[in-house]
Amino acid sequence: QLPPGKPEIFKCRSPNKETFTCWWRPGTDGGLPTNYSLTYHREGETLMHECPDYITGGPNSCHFGKQYTSMWRTYIMMVNATNQMGSSFSDELYVDVTYIVQPDPPLELAVEVKQPEDRKPYLWIKWSPPTLIDLKTGWFTLLYEIRLKPEKAAEWEIHFAGQQTEFKILSLHPGQKYLVQVRCKPDHGYWSAWSPATFIQIPSDFTMND
């Protein structure tokens, strides 16, 4: 029977800069029941606080609700593992909420084949930003990527779309069914998961080349 091994805070994420969650990996338990607590203070302060919510984020997590989240302050946190034989502490982790945002996937992905009379046909892809993100405040710049592939193809092709919420693709294989997905990230954060795939059947008379 031993003191617990050193835990590690391995990830912190925020969906929208208004709340965030951090997760830790326990070290070895030393063969004894082990309690974990996360403590933190804000940069420039000495007062230590304990994690306000160990439930919302699941096992080995700490969730910071709106009233505990501030964009303009760096959080310095550590996890303490304790059993009957002693304690061990994780390394301190410095967290700036601005840099840990991972939004939900974009919404309302719509894909359509456009066949104008006077121009070459194209695939028109359109989507909306995730609902949790408030783009009107200017705090957020969301960037988007699209990926698509024929249903039976092994590799996706990925396109960076900048801040635009629509994208055109020419030159597709006629008669094939394509899968299309979109994802987003804030300018300083992490890519969201890909949205659910939308399927589109390319007509057999689609002009292949431009």
């Epitope: 092709e157 396109h159 960076f160 635009q164 020419l170």
Partner: antibody
Framework: EVQLLESGGGLVQPGGSLRLSCAAS????????WHWVRQAPGKGLEWVSD????????GYADSVKGRFTISRDNSKNTLYLQMNSLRAEDTAVYYC???????????WGQGTLVTVTS | QSVLTQPPSASGTPGQRVTISCTGS?????????VHWYQQLPGTAPKLLIY???WRPSGVPDRFSGSKSGTSASLAISGLRSEDEADYYC???????????FGGGTKLTVL
Amino acid sequence: EVQLLESGGGLVQPGGSLRLSCAASGFTFSSYWWHWVRQAPGKGLEWVSDISSLSSYTGYADSVKGRFTISRDNSKNTLYLQMNSLRAEDTAVYYCARGLDARRMDYWGQGTLVTVTS
Amino acid sequence: QSVLTQPPSASGTPGQRVTISCTGSSSNIGYGYVVHWYQQLPGTAPKLLIYRNNWRPSGVPDRFSGSKSGTSASLAISGLRSEDEADYYCAAWDDSLNGWLFGGGTKLTVL
């Protein structure tokens, strides 16, 4: 017929400024992404900047970030590159290029030479 | 540092098949971003030759073809002609740079 004509290049001293223009005709200018790409004498191509069709997104190579500004005037069918704090290593032929789907550069201008020397 | 690596030179005789490689990394070609190829004839502006890995713009002969696998892409030119003598560049978006990357270019000589 697609036509792209760059202008505004010339000789400038280090620390100086230039504004390049790219006048486009023969298609709907506002529907496309636009790029600036440069080529130093005897060297390869280097991407400089791009701007999205709705002007909402602008991107820059690290080597020019904070010194160059890309912009567009859809009413004049013209792309611009404002170059400030120019350095000797900015000496190159500057090309404008139209960005189609996947932002591939499907048409290029003939280029304008920028020479930065004291 | 993100780079696309091309051989500086390649050569072949008329009628031969020549392949030019473009090797990237997990932040560009390996990430899934598409590869474009440009041809620059001496003293002229670059011209789009292959786009989105393997598509040919109208007007480009079918002697030119592109492919992509993993972190690399290739341009193949079959039935080599003297007018193919040019510099060839690959290009791909790079996620870590948030910008376009060009390969260093390959000078093709037709012997």
